[in-house]
Interface confidence: low
């Protein structure tokens, strides 16, 4: 960025100036003018381009084409495009003329030294624009956008360290550098110029809190060579020219986008003239590079699974075995959190959300640790944070959280187009209350964080009718082999009553729910006839259906869904303390591993040797090429108001779509 530098020439002695390649310098010839001057001529040595700009209306002209009428509105513009080999090796000569004199009245000479300076992010951002054609002070979204990308260096590459990599001002291991973005300062010009000029790398104190910079000052394979030069308390750094014409810096993010932080960070290099001992150094030129901190991105259940997490607790051996078998079928890794670490807190879905951050050079999985802080609260930090697995959390200052702050209440849709707008990374779905009402909501700090990521704009659904209050209690997504690529599953009391009425008409009214449940206390069976004659249950489920229908309309509108994109899964709810819980295991609360679904075993009415609820679900999902495995979670999960999805978590493959190519 030019500071619109103006150089004043003198008749008494030649003037020297430094100019930057490609940057215009204005030459002021009006400071000392011989008496009687009516015209002037301007010439430059080869490599110096000189233009005259008569006024705003008329474009600039090359100066060496003719003699110019002396007029204080004229601007003389000098540009050099390649760096000098030596100090003052180019010059501009101005001659002042009168119509009465054949020879020039006087000469002024301006000696020029050209230096080329650029500060760039290492633009291996696939397809992002070449720096010569863009305003580097901007960061632009989209396939033809430009600007650098920074990762929050929130993993722990050195297992011997206690903290995340960006928590101090050191590079502890070389692997750490892979999580950083490269920034290059290139300078070309006579070395002698830097005897009385200096280069300063600088940023604002605001940005210094959000990113930090290391300068490589020694052998690349030695950690100590990476000197911390900007960030935290450091806002400027005089750059020693250690490696001739190119200095390399490594930049890491310290903070994710959040309330009050857009994610944009600027670094500047300024060339300062320090030749005059009586004055402070004066700026000649500043170049800027802008980075955007990569957002944390959630992965929908339709993306391929990489790793499944489950807790082993006192009474869930069969459940863990079933999940292990499903993971094996789906070809993904299984991690079991032992009882010593979970202390019988089995709700691993509620404790954390597994997502990722991405730059062109690196993709890093990142766990978002919920503020719920049950007995599993140490698991994400102690067991998931590690080499190439980052960690982030948000907790309200007053520590006040509700059940809605558990991450069973944080989901994301597959990619959608809604109201003409593309959401190539889907939209985050969180549960809250009806607009304008004062019930439970996700804590503000989590909502702020999710909104600030920008790439998956959140939709708030109504969940306060549920006792636990999580979106995964009535909603899930499964992959589908067609253009849409997915179906949304919604829990449906209406569909369940319809199914039971059909079975009753066919003479199966005495078929029993909950037959075969293995539990310490015998679970009471109930027949289809009893369900359909229970007025309270029917009325309550009408209310539940209206709550789900409210969400259905929101989801259709905000995700651009048609009725054919939605599958109604039969489900009944019961009331506890005026809020809803699943009457039988909640079928939509399922584990989706590619085409393999781990669905809570509903223990529905057995008709002709088959559970009619399982049969119905199979008939709805198997035509999509999905394989349904019904997992008995009744005692260890369902009785505690959760199901298969609540008790598992999945790390998934990132989107192939690159977030910087979208336009939020």
């Amino acid at each position: 960025m030019s500071l619109q530098r103006i150089v004043r020439v003198s008749l008494e002695h030649p003037t020297s100036a430094v100019c930057v390649a490609g940057v215009e310098t204005l030459v002021d010839i009006y400071g000392s003018v011989p008496e009687g001057t009516e015209m002037f001529e301007v010439y430059g040595t080869p490599g110096v381009d000189i233009y005259i700009s008569p006024n705003m209306e008329r474009g600039r002209e090359r100066a060496d084409t003719r003699r110019w009428r002396f007029d204080a509105t004229l601007e003389i513009i000098v540009v050099m495009n390649s760096p000098s080999n030596d100090l003052n090796d180019s010059h501009v000569q101005i001659s002042y003329h009168s119509s009465h004199e054949p020879l020039p009245l006087a000469y002024a000479v301006l000696y020029l030294t050209c230096v080329d300076i650029s500060l760039d992010c290492d633009l291996n951002c696939e397809g992002r624009q070449d720096r010569n054609f863009v305003d580097k002070r901007q960061w632009v979204w989209g396939p033809s956008g430009y600007g650098g990308i920074l990762l929050v260096n929130c993993d722990r590459d050195d297992p011997s360290c206690d903290v995340q990599d960006n928590c101090d001002q050191h590079v502890h291991c070389l692997q750490d550098l892979e999580d950083m973005s490269v920034m290059v300062l290139r300078t070309q010009g006579p070395a002698a110029l830097f005897d009385d000029h200096k280069l300063v790398l600088h940023t604002s104190s605001y940005d210094a809190k959000r990113a930090q910079v290391f300068h490589i000052c020694g052998p690349e394979d030695v950690c100590e060579a990476y000197r911390h030069v900007l960030g935290q308390d450091k806002v400027s750094y005089e750059v020693p020219r250690l490696h001739g014409d190119e200095e390399r810096f490594f930049v890491e993010g310290l903070s994710f986008p959040d309330a009050g932080f857009t994610g944009l960070i600027s670094f500047h290099v300024t060339l300062l003239d320090d030749s005059n001992e009586d004055f402070s150094a004066s700026p000649i030129f500043t170049d800027t590079v802008v980075f955007r901190v990569a957002p944390w991105i959630m992965t929908p259940s339709t993306l391929p699974p990489l790793e499944v997490y489950v807790c082993r607790v006192r009474n869930n051996t069969c459940f863990v075995d079933a999940v292990a078998e499903l993971a094996r079928k789906a070809g993904c890794k299984l991690t079991i959190c032992p009882q010593a670490e979970n202390r019988n807190d089995r709700w691993i879905q509620d404790e954390m959300e597994l997502g990722y951050v991405q730059a062109p050079h690196k993709t890093l999985p990142v766990v978002f640790d919920s503020p719920r802080n049950g007995e599993l609260q140490d698991f994400p930090y102690k067991r998931i944070l590690g080499p190439d697995f980052g960690y982030v959390t948000r907790e309200p200052r007053d520590r006040s959280v509700s059940g809605l702050d558990s991450f069973g209440n944080l989901e994301v849709s597959p990619p959608v187009v809604a109201n003409g707008k593309e959401y190539p990374l889907g939209r985050i779905l969180i549960g809250g209350n009806l607009p304008g009402s004062s019930g439970r909501r996700v804590t503000q700090v989590v909502r702020d964080f999710l909104h600030a990521q920008k790439v998956q704009p959140p939709v708030e659904l109504f969940v306060d009718w549920l006792a636990v209050g999580h979106v995964d209690e009535f909603l899930s997504f499964v992959p589908a082999p067609d253009g849409k690529g997915f179906r949304m599953l919604l829990a449906s009391p209406g569909a369940c009553f319809k199914l039971f009425q059909e079975k009753q008409k066919c003479g199966h009214g005495r078929a029993l729910l909950f037959q075969g449940v293995v539990d310490d206390e015998q679970v009471k069976t109930i027949s289809i006839n009893q369900v359909l004659s229970n007025k309270d249950l029917i009325n309550y489920n009408k209310f539940v259906q209206s709550c789900i229908d409210w969400n259905r309309e929101v989801l259709k509108r905000e995700l651009g869904l048609a009725e054919c994109d939605i599958i109604d899964i039969p489900q009944l709810f019961k009331t506890e303390r005026k809020k809803a819980t699943a009457f039988f295991p909640d079928l939509v609360n399922m584990l989706v591993l590619g085409k393999h679904l781990g669905i809570p075993k509903p223990f529905g009415p057995i008709i002709n040797g088959c559970c009619c609820l399982e049969e119905k679900v199979r008939s709805l999902l198997e035509p999509l090429g999905l394989h349904c495995t019904f997992i008995d979670d009744f005692t260890p999960y369902h009785m505690l108001h959760g199901e298969v999805h609540c008790g598992t978590n999945v790390c998934r493959k990132p989107f192939s779509f690159k977030w910087w190519n979208m336009v939020p």
Partner: antibody
Framework: EVQLLESGAEVKKPGSSVKVSCKSS????????VVWVRQAPGQGPEWMGG????????HYAQKFQGRVTITADEDTSTAYMELNSLRSDDTAVYYC????????????WGQGTLVTVSS | EIVLTQSPATLSLSPGQRATLSCGAS???????LAWYQQKPGLAPRLLIY???IRATGIPDRFRGSGSGTDFTLTISGLEPEDFAVYYC??????????FGGGTKVEIK
């Protein structure tokens, strides 16, 4: 409805310990949290801590951290509260109560155990 | 921790009158996790209202809880002789820093 039966009144010397028991009947012990609340003469109730028997993990109010131990025995459906290093200002009625899992909200209360600390 | 301040300390009313008891919190009680208890001499507290406004099982509808954030109210619409007791408010939003108010005594005038 859950019934809670607490152990009998105790008189203790300063510096000693007391262990109060609370036996539950009429409901599934595992399905609730058990909380302990004390009430000094003429004062409002004071929440001491609680335990979810299913998770077997106690939670303590900061004030009592290090001095109180709350345990639960699933086999006998009994919860226990032990308070150490007793002082005269620990003289109070100690109540146990059942609570819903997801919040520590005392719902059904025991009859209370009077603990008197006096030299 | 959240401090709960109840007012007035004592309320002298006649049977049939309306009683209005206040409970102020030093900071917002999230999710309105506030309860009201009634306690008679020598007995354990009895849960009347939870989640600020939901009546517990078996509680007559003359007891009504309202409010949100930092200001909560218990209203007894027509006092019956058995309603004269001490009433405590209780917040359970910030475990394990759970607190009770100092109480309001409702006595016969």
């Amino acid at each position: 409805e859950v019934q809670l039966l607490e152990s009998g009144a105790e008189v203790k010397k300063p510096g000693s310990s007391v262990k109060v028991s609370c036996k539950s009947s009429g409901g599934t012990f595992n399905n609730y949290a058990v909380v302990w609340v004390r009430q000094a003469p003429g004062q409002g109730p004071e929440w001491m801590g609680g335990i979810i028997p299913m998770f077997d993990t106690p939670h303590y109010a900061q004030k009592f951290q290090g001095r109180v131990t709350i345990t639960a025995d699933e086999d006998t459906s009994t919860a226990y509260m032990e308070l150490n290093s007793l002082r005269s200002d620990d003289t109070a009625v100690y109540y146990c109560a059942t609570s819903y899992f997801r919040q520590w909200l005392p719902r059904d209360w025991g009859q209370g155990t009077l603990v008197t600390v006096s030299s | 921790e959240i401090v709960l301040t109840q007012s007035p300390a004592t309320l002298s009313l006649s049977p049939g009158q309306r009683a209005t008891l206040s409970c102020g919190a030093s900071q917002s009680v999230s999710s309105n996790y506030l309860a009201w208890y009634q306690q008679k001499p020598g007995l354990a507290p009895r849960l009347l209202i939870y989640d600020a406004s939901i009546r517990a099982t078996g509680i007559p509808d003359r007891f009504r809880g309202s409010g949100s954030g930092t200001d909560f109210t218990l209203t007894i619409s027509g006092l019956e002789p058995e309603d004269f007791a001490v009433y405590y408010c209780h917040q359970y939003a910030t475990a394990p820093q759970i607190t009770f108010g100092g109480g309001t005594k409702v006595e016969i005038k």
